[in-house]
């Protein structure tokens, strides 16, 4: 048993260009707090996988208000260490996630709003009882400086906190076969007494009274070979009398997982999947209660009044996860219609509509042409929120009020010749093209999309078209 300790030294803008904007403002003062999540081994698990070694929340830091015009400084931090107690042996290798959270203290409806500001993660080797290890991690433009260590809780000592020490009974030396407890030379290593009858060949213990089995063995005293089938499996020691495998109980027999955890066999022994609020090898550790405020983003904590009962976070709209730590990207559902811009404000969704559209989801198409006339015979066209005039030949501009050279815009397609005329323009088409503006090839070459002037077209017979 022992405690992992984390000391945050600073959180602020990292070096280099692109300094982040201050997370707080005069209108929205805020304060920071931190969450640490520990997992055994060098796993690269997802952020939301269980913190099997434990988790901790810091206190809230001092309230900070940005000074207008000043660069974002290192932000004021909460006092004290983050401590994560561990009940079993310290694994030596571990993964960590450290999250920096911002609590906004403005005029929020329904209390303060929390948002994740930065998340750093890493995998480290660390012996218990060693000195503080210093670390610097960057998340985007932010930089987090911190130190950490693992220390054993008496009477445990050693790099894994599995050796036990007791004060010396005699001042001069330790008892027979027992060594002094480095670095506590005035204490002696205590003999580790396993459960009575624990197999010396197939069992071992890390704490007194325990009997843990080596791979391939099971039972309370590790005397029963593991097997999955009585006669069909070719593995395992066979019984001299039957030639069959001895049907030993599996590692999940009797369900070693506490607090409603579910057991699954692994190649080495077993694994417990723990319910929320519990962790540890057998789900026996419950380090988080509702009093610790485990529910982020305004989540409501239910149950978990004492360390032996699980808590459940009821998340507000827009958040999910066992601790309401994950923001639901509600804009990914594209709720805003007609090209509206989606804004997820946390407590609500807003759609910023394009011109010509209105309504909570931009579902109402306003009549862009209402009350807007196009001059000189032009026709008004609704064009995605901005009215547009399709002008009669010889006129141009937004409202067709400008007299234009009808041929200036090259209105004849496919190489047709344009002639200005009192009634507008006339296109003299190249051979093989038809239409008022030569836009129709008589015999296209069958391509799926032709350029403006497809090459190689033979002249058609204009007499065949009216």
């Amino acid at each position: 048993a022992g405690v992992f300790e984390l000391q945050i030294h600073s959180f602020g803008p990292g070096p280099g260009p692109g300094a982040p904007r201050s997370p707080c403002s005069a209108r929205l003062p805020c304060r920071l707090f931190f969450r640490v999540c520990l997992k055994p081994g060098l796993s690269e698990e997802a952020a939301e996988s269980p913190c099997a070694l434990g988790a901790a929340l810091s206190a809230r830091g001092p309230v900070y208000t940005e000074q207008p015009g000043a660069p974002a400084p290192d932000l004021p931090l909460p006092d004290g260490l983050l401590q994560v107690p561990f009940r079993d042996a310290w694994p030596g290798t571990f993964s960590f996630i450290i999250e920096t959270w911002r609590e906004e203290l403005g005029d929020q409806i329904g209390g303060p709003a929390w948002s994740l500001l930065a998340r750093v993660a890493g995998r480290r080797r660390l012996a218990a009882g060693g000195p503080w290890a210093r670390d610097i991690q960057r998340a985007g433009a932010w930089e987090l400086r911190f130190s950490y260590r693992a220390r054993c809780e008496p009477p445990a000592v050693g790099t894994a906190c599995t050796r036990l020490c007791r004060p010396r009974s005699a001042p001069s030396r330790c008892g027979p076969g027992l060594r002094p407890c480095a670095p506590l030379e005035d204490e002696c290593e205590a003999p580790l007494v396993c459960r009575a009858g624990c197999s010396p060949e197939h069992g071992f213990c890390e704490q007194p009274g325990e009997c843990r089995c080596l791979e391939g063995w099971t039972g309370p005293l590790c005397t029963v070979p593991v097997s999955t089938s009585s006669c069909l499996s070719p593995r395992g020691p066979s019984s001299a009398t039957t030639g069959c495998l001895v049907p030993g109980p599996g590692p999940c027999d009797g369900n070693p997982c506490a607090n409603g955890g579910s057991c699954s066999e692994t190649p080495r022994s077993f694994e417990c999947t723990c319910p929320r609020g519990f962790y540890g090898l057998r789900c026996e550790v419950s380090g988080v209660t509702c009093a610790d405020g485990p529910c982020f983003n305004g989540g409501l904590c239910v149950g978990g009044a004492d360390p032996d009962s699980a808590y459940i976070c009821h998340c507000p709209p827009g958040f999910q996860g066992s601790n309401c730590e994950k923001r639901v990207d509600r804009c990914s559902l594209q709720p805003c219609r007609n090209g509206g811009l989606c804004l997820d404000l946390g407590h609500a969704l807003r759609c910023r509509c394009r011109a010509g559209f209105a309504g909570p989801r931009c579902e109402h198409d306003l009549d862009d042409c209402a009350g807007r006339a196009c001059a000189n015979g032009g026709t008004c066209v609704e064009g995605g929120g901005a009215h547009r005039c399709s002008c009669a030949l010889g006129f141009g501009g937004r409202d067709c009020r400008e007299r234009a050279d009808p041929c200036a815009a090259r209105p004849c397609a496919h190489g047709g010749r344009c002639y200005a005329h009192f009634s507008g323009l006339v296109c003299a088409c190249a051979p093989g093209y038809m239409g008022a503006r030569c836009e129709f090839p008589v015999h296209p070459d069958g391509a799926s999309a032709l350029p403006a002037a497809p090459p190689g077209l033979r002249p058609g017979d204009p007499q065949r078209y009216l």
């Epitope: 399709s390 397609a413 239409g435 503006r437 836009e439 129709f440 090839p441 999309a449 403006a452």
Partner: nanobody, 117 residues
Framework: EVQLVESGGGLVQPGGSLTLSCAAS????????LAWYRQAPGKKRELVAG???????VYFVSVKGRFTISRDNAKNSVYLQMNSLRAEDTAVYYC???????????WGQGTLVTVSS
């Protein structure tokens, strides 16, 4: 990019009628010149009827009076109403759009019209 999707093709008896529809997306049809082409087996694709942005039309001489091209800018669609159909009208009919903003031509995938008794 303009996308064109034709519909309305099928089997019809000589003398019968059929209306082809073409829905355009990607650009407002007010700024497109639209047309119907057809391609009979073993023959070149040929213009059947076209309608310019100003509403002026052009028709293949053998369909004039039988076929009518029209456009509905509000529905972003162009139609070909075909009456008094003949066996020689059997072909794959293609929707065509000429974009004046690109400028470039676009084609639909085609719809089969079979006139047979």
């Amino acid at each position: 990019e303009v996308q064109l999707v034709e519909s309305g093709g099928g089997l019809v008896q000589p003398g019968g009628s059929l209306t082809l529809s073409c829905a355009a997306s990607g650009e407002t049809v007010s700024f497109l010149s639209l047309a119907w082409y057809r391609q009979a087996p073993g023959k070149k694709r040929e213009l059947v009827a076209g309608i310019s942005t100003d509403g002026s039309t052009v028709y293949f001489v053998s369909v004039k009076g039988r076929f009518t091209i029209s456009r509905d800018n509000a529905k972003n669609s162009v139609y070909l109403q075909m009456n008094s159909l003949r066996a020689e009208d059997t072909a794959v009919y293609y929707c065509y759009a000429y974009s004046w903003t690109t400028p470039r031509a676009y084609w639909g995938q085609g719809t089969l019209v079979t006139v047979s008794s």
